[in-house]
Interface confidence: low
């Protein structure tokens, strides 16, 4: 569609059908800006404002902002993984782009230029009770894209999720689709993550999320972030494509059980 032209490379996601949308709480009552939750999520949440801490697993920064680690951060990838970035003006980020690449994309906004998007900005927000932690950028599975459209009615700002058929960049994904059947999306994410770490010479990837894959390379139902010292990493439940099942997260206070949930 015409409105997808400016988005640059597009993650193809499962369509947000009525069942998926029914799992969404309405967006928070107070938002300066609403953004889609991470990856292939269907729900809306609040964008982070300038100066707020951010990271790969946090809400996305608002329009014109980018999540950036501190300039003197020795391990920028780790900083973003740990949520120690800051939402800063996107123009300030460009000065550090060379320094940051080719780390996994940091949270950004959906209105970036194609150049920005290909330079490493992928949205990665979360919503209350439904934390998206597995970044789906490595497994574009479906032939739909999701675009947030903001109504311009002054008194009643309406937000909706539009589903548009993918009409461009399809060729970019043909080899990846083939790869998915060969390896499975989880195995590919794991390999990509490890390749990133190897490229960055990250010798101690504490805090990096290595996905939990089955023998066929698909996601196991239960995924967990690594523990930090005595603090247990939180766990969440996903379907076989890594798509989180709504609401099932724990921050170490209690275990999360995924055995009763259906995998797609």
């Amino acid at each position: 569609g015409a409105s997808s032209a400016g988005l640059g490379p597009v993650v193809r996601c499962e369509p947000c059908d009525a069942r998926a949308l029914a799992q969404c709480a309405p967006p928070p009552a107070v938002c300066a800006e609403l953004v889609r939750e991470p990856g292939c999520g269907c729900c809306l949440t609040c964008a982070l404002s300038e100066g707020q801490p951010c990271g790969i697993y946090t809400e996305r920064c608002g329009s014109g902002l980018r999540c950036q680690p501190s300039p003197d951060e020795a391990r920028p990838l780790q900083a973003l993984l740990d949520g120690r970035g800051l939402c800063v003006n996107a123009s300030a980020v460009s000065r550090l782009r060379a320094y940051l690449l080719p780390a996994p994309p940091a949270p950004g906004n959906a209105s970036e230029s194609e150049e920005d998007r290909s330079a490493g900005s992928v949205e990665s927000p979360s919503v209350s009770s439904t934390h998206r932690v597995s970044d789906p950028k490595f497994h574009p599975l479906h032939s739909k894209i999701i675009i947030i459209k903001k109504g311009h009615a002054k008194d009643s700002q309406r937000y909706k999720v539009d589903y548009e058929s993918q009409s461009t960049d399809t060729q970019n994904f043909s080899s990846e689709s083939k790869r998915e059947t060969e390896y499975g999306p989880c195995r590919r994410e794991m390999e990509d993550t490890l390749n990133h770490l190897k490229f960055l010479n990250v010798l101690s990837p504490r805090g990096v999320h290595i996905p939990n894959c089955d023998k066929k390379g698909f996601y196991k139902k239960k995924q967990c972030r690594p523990s930090k010292g005595r603090k247990r990493g939180f766990c969440w439940c996903v379907d076989k494509y890594g798509q989180p099942l709504p609401g099932y997260t724990t921050k170490g206070k209690e275990d999360v059980h995924c055995y009763s949930m259906q995998s797609k």
Partner: antibody, heavy 120, light 110 residues
């Protein structure tokens, strides 16, 4: 201190309308939502809907759709709830409550309540 | 009729431990939505007691604790005191796009 102060008790006839106000103080009004909850005599709490004090977005309980309207006046930090076509079973104490979405949509501050009696 | 199920009443002697159950379904508590608890003392407005399943706002004694498992989210009160006598309500969100409450539980301190 943070508080919500509601308007006084009302007595209405069936078929009439009532408009209850809820004045916020002690916090930035537009940084939160306001939810309305009612409680019939001797009964439990019933959620009626909420309104964003930031942009006026609303979400009403299905049962009350078409009869209830929630509005805000940011200049006075006041939220309003209007209920039309009143029936006797609308007799209840009406509460406004602050919606703190970062607490998972918990209602962290409540008004003192407004008794609305619908009687012929 | 309330969407979340609570016992109409519970009772306990001072110093005892009591638990108030709150049971939902796969479209609310079981879907992972947070559960909150409110205490309503006689003749007053409700007050937030527990938010996000197990968190206490400042000023709420640690005698009150919440948890969640599956479609159930109990509230536990230890070291029962006379001033705990009140109505208690659980609240969650439902995928039918509405906030839902339990029917309320009257706690009597014997």
């Amino acid at each position: 201190q943070v508080q919500l102060v509601q308007s006084g008790a009302e007595v209405k006839k069936p078929g009439a309308s009532v408009k209850v106000s809820c004045k916020a103080s002690g916090y930035t009004f537009t940084s939160y939502g306001i939810s309305w909850v009612r409680q019939a005599p001797g009964q439990g709490l019933e959620w009626m809907g909420w309104i964003s004090a930031y942009n006026g977005n609303t979400n009403y309980a299905q049962k009350l759709q078409g009869r209830v309207t929630m509005t805000t006046d940011t200049s006075t930090s006041t939220a309003y709830m209007e209920l039309r076509s009143l029936r006797s079973d609308d007799t209840a104490v009406y509460y406004c409550a602050r919606v703190k979405w970062e607490l998972g949509w918990a209602f962290d501050i409540w008004g003192q309540g407004t008794m609305v009696t619908v009687s012929s | 009729q309330a969407v979340l199920t609570q016992p109409p009443s519970v009772s306990g002697a001072p110093g005892q431990r009591v638990t108030i159950s709150c049971t939902g379904s796969s479209s609310n508590i079981g879907a992972g939505y947070d559960v909150h608890w409110y205490q309503q003392l006689p003749g007053t407005a409700p007050k937030l007691l527990i938010y996000g399943n197990s968190n206490r706002p400042s000023g709420v004694p640690d005698r009150f604790s919440g948890s969640k498992s599956g479609t159930s989210a109990p509230l536990a009160i230890t070291g029962l005191q006379a001033e705990d006598e009140a109505d208690y309500y659980c609240q969650s969100y439902d995928s039918s796009l509405s906030t839902v409450f339990g029917g309320g539980t009257k706690l009597t301190v014997l």
